[in-house]
């Protein structure tokens, strides 16, 4: 009763197609699989960036797998062959591991790479990245940005650099079609006549770095003597209303500061009759239903409602009808007082609950 | 309360998946592996068919039941092929992450059913 053995896959390698971090892991079937012709062999693949605590694991029947990596660090991977129990009339059989690594040979010292890389996807329309030159690099150093995401045939170089003192310190990207909800890879490399420059690699998803425009058309509506509805509109652009969260900052008579986070374009505020002035500002951010993260917009222009305004609107919309009803109540009460008083007292509400 | 937008069921599912990914301390479902799916037509049913193979993992049971809301009756074999390419298994945590990303994309695009 001989023990069933299987070899590890052959020619296991990590291939870099030039997509700035999106790599191919590929291999060939193990030697001497003749005994298992009727059997679907599987492969268990484990891989990670060197330094990462956890391995990513997949099991596949294919001879390749693709994933994204951080090319600032090395990559290690290992694979073995699995013979399912159906093939062996018993327990699953595993081969020994085949291992491989991949890294980009670093040029230059780490200090020469770009510093403080910052990318913002303005209003889900315009991507802008900026950086600072590496520490101690000379003015003859120039940096170049390349980017790739799934859908592009090959990595593209920035065509619209932001410059300072003749050096590239940022990139304005062109319209990026179908580029969100997938990994967006960037490499910033550099050249200098004096010394080699270290490349930097970045990966993010565009929907998570969106900074919307601030909300517009802020308005007030008095709902009752005690309530004011604050309203605003979403800014022009491709972001639908359902993707926004809002933060409101409200000042009453320059003292009370109320901040609230809401999902809709309205907020109802409880007020007192003594309110002389009301001001509010709003800002927006992409919510958790459309992204994992986001950047708050700038605050909107301040919208204020002066006390005189408040009083006039209150007079027109509330106190005039109320006064009319009050006179009517007094009149009816007068009539009722002539008869035996068998009716409950009606007390008008003059004040808001605070 | 006013009309309930059609997006609500998708919002609830997104919230549940966000909850799972944020509360993940140890490997989700002990590192169980599930079939990777094609996130296109028949995606809810395919996701359910894949996740249902994880047993004894209370963390994803609510997700399984919520996916069943979109896909309550079994789809006949000829109706969709999302799951028919069963060639790669991935960890549940990665599956949930990929599914969540796709659901957020659907929500942004207003594709609620």
């Amino acid at each position: 009763d001989t023990e069933i053995k299987v070899n590890p896959p052959q020619d296991f390698e990590i291939v870099d197609p030039g997509y700035l971090g999106y790599l191919y892991l590929q291999w060939q079937p193990p030697l001497s699989l003749d005994h298992f012709k009727e059997c679907t062999v599987e492969y268990e693949l484990k891989y990670r960036n060197i330094g990462s605590e956890t391995w990513k694991t997949i099991i596949t029947k294919n001879l390749h797998y693709k994933d994204g990596f951080d090319l600032n660090k090395g990559i290690e991977a290992k694979i073995h062959t699995l013979l399912p129990w159906q093939c062996t009339n018993g327990s699953e059989v595993q081969s020994s591991w085949a291992e491989t690594t991949y890294w980009i040979s670093p040029q230059g010292i780490p200090e020469t790479k770009v510093q403080d890389m910052d990318c913002v996807y303005y209003n889900w329309q315009y991507l802008l990245c900026s950086w600072k030159p590496g520490i101690g690099v000379l003015l003859d150093t120039n940096y170049n940005l390349f980017y790739w995401y799934e859908g592009l045939d090959h990595a593209l170089q920035c065509v619209d650099y932001i410059k300072a003192d003749g050096q590239n310190i940022g990139c304005r990207f062109p319209y990026l079609e179908a580029s969100d909800y997938k990994d967006f890879y960037i490499c910033v490399n550099g050249s200098s006549e004096n010394k080699p420059i270290r490349s930097s690699y970045f990966t993010f998803q565009l929907q998570n770095i969106v900074k919307p425009l601030p909300p517009v058309y802020l308005t007030f509506t008095r709902e009752s003597s005690c309530e004011i509805k604050l309203k605003w509109s979403i800014p022009l652009g491709p972001i639908p209303a359902r993707c926004f969260d809002y933060e409101i900052e409200i000042r009453e008579d320059d003292t009370t500061l109320v901040t609230a986070t809401v999902e809709n374009e309205t907020y109802t505020l409880k007020t007192t009759n003594e309110t002389r002035q009301l001001c509010f500002v709003v800002r927006s951010k992409v919510n958790i239903y459309c992204s994992d993260d986001g950047i708050w917009s700038e605050w909107s222009d301040k919208q204020c409602w002066e006390g005189e305004d408040l009083s006039k609107k209150t007079l027109l919309r509330f106190w005039l009808p109320f006064g009319f009803i009050l006179i009517l109540v007094i009149f009816v009460t007068g009539l009722l007082l002539r008869k035996p008083n068998t009716y409950p007292k009606m007390i008008p509400e003059f004040f808001c609950d605070t | 309360p006013g009309p309930v937008p059609p997006s609500t069921a998708l919002r609830e599912l997104i919230e549940e998946l966000v909850n799972i990914t944020q509360n993940q301390k140890a490997p989700l479902c002990n590192g169980s592996m599930v079939w990777s799916i094609n996130l296109t037509a028949g995606m809810y049913c395919a996701a359910l068919e894949s996740l249902i193979n994880v047993s004894g993992c209370s963390a994803i049971e609510k997700t399984q039941r919520m996916l069943s809301g979109f896909c309550p009756h079994k789809v006949s074999a000829g109706q969709f092929s999302s799951l028919h390419v069963r060639d790669t298994k991935i960890e549940v945590a990665q599956f949930v992450k990929d599914l969540l990303l796709h659901l957020k994309k659907l929500f942004r695009e207003g594709r609620f059913n």
Partner: antibody, heavy 118, light 111 residues
Framework: EVQLVESGGGLVQPGGSLRLSCAAS????????MSWVRQAPGKGLEWVAS???????YYPDSVKGRFTISRDNAKNSLYLQMNSLRAEDTAVYYC????????????WGQGTLVTVSS | DIQMTQSPSSLSASVGDRVTITCKAS??????????MHWYQQKPGKAPKLLIY???NLESGVPSRFSGSGSGTDFTLTISSLQPEDFATYYC?????????FGGGTKVEIK
């Protein structure tokens, strides 16, 4: 606590119509599929209709074309419009939260009696 | 349509007894290795209650004396030690193929 309360049952003549309602509470109604299951007096259970959270509907041949299941997510309500009623439709009609083909009918209402008789 | 045949149609048992109810489907109700068979309990004048889903999974809140087993076409519901509150009618149901169908029921009575 999940609660399902049926209403709208009663006596109706053959060929007549009736609309059953089910008020749901204690769970996020819109996230779950719902069903109607009936039980003729002294008999077993029979599945009548299902509706997914997205509004897709499913029926057995015995009621297809005569019964219509619908839902109003704003009101947390499920409905069953029954037309061209027959004597064999006489039963207690249960509203149930359907957790799908992998979980079955997870919660049931107390039922409402529909009697089809001349 | 898949026919579900339950046996026995009724049985008498005493408190503490081990009770076994079987359900036979006219064709397999398995889907990718999962049995789409569920068990319900119904007391007189009350709504049914889900006990077991997918042949062997205990629904939340159901006592552990209830268990299910089987695959393909043959399934069993077992009550390891019958309690007074367990006297009821039990139904099996398949969800592998539309229309979903129930068994005729098994009435468990006090001996």
């Amino acid at each position: 606590e999940v609660q399902l309360v049926e209403s709208g049952g009663g006596l109706v003549q053959p060929g007549g119509s009736l609309r059953l309602s089910c008020a749901a509470s204690g769970f996020t109604f819109i996230s779950y599929a719902m069903s109607w299951v009936r039980q003729a007096p002294g008999k077993g259970l029979e599945w009548v209709a299902s509706i997914s959270s997205g509004g897709n509907t499913y029926y057995p041949d015995s009621v297809k074309g005569r019964f219509t299941i619908s839902r109003d997510n704003a009101k947390n309500s499920l409905y069953l419009q029954m037309n061209s009623l027959r004597a064999e439709d006489t039963a207690v009609y249960y509203c149930a939260r359907l957790d799908g083909y992998y979980f079955g009918f997870a919660y049931w209402g107390q039922g409402t009696l529909v009697t089809v008789s001349s | 349509d898949i026919q579900m045949t339950q046996s026995p149609s009724s049985l008498s048992a005493s408190v503490g007894d081990r009770v076994t109810i079987t359900c036979k489907a006219s064709e397999s109700v398995d889907n990718y290795g999962k049995s789409l068979m569920h068990w319900y309990q119904q007391k007189p004048g009350k709504a049914p209650k889900l006990l077991i889903y997918r042949a062997s999974n205990l629904e939340s809140g159901v006592p552990s004396r209830f268990s299910g087993s089987g695959s393909g076409t043959d399934f069993t519901l077992t009550i390891s030690s019958l309690q007074p509150e367990d006297f009821a009618t039990y139904y099996c149901q398949q969800s592998n193929e539309d229309p979903w169908t129930f068994g005729g029921g098994t009435k468990v009575e006090i001996k």
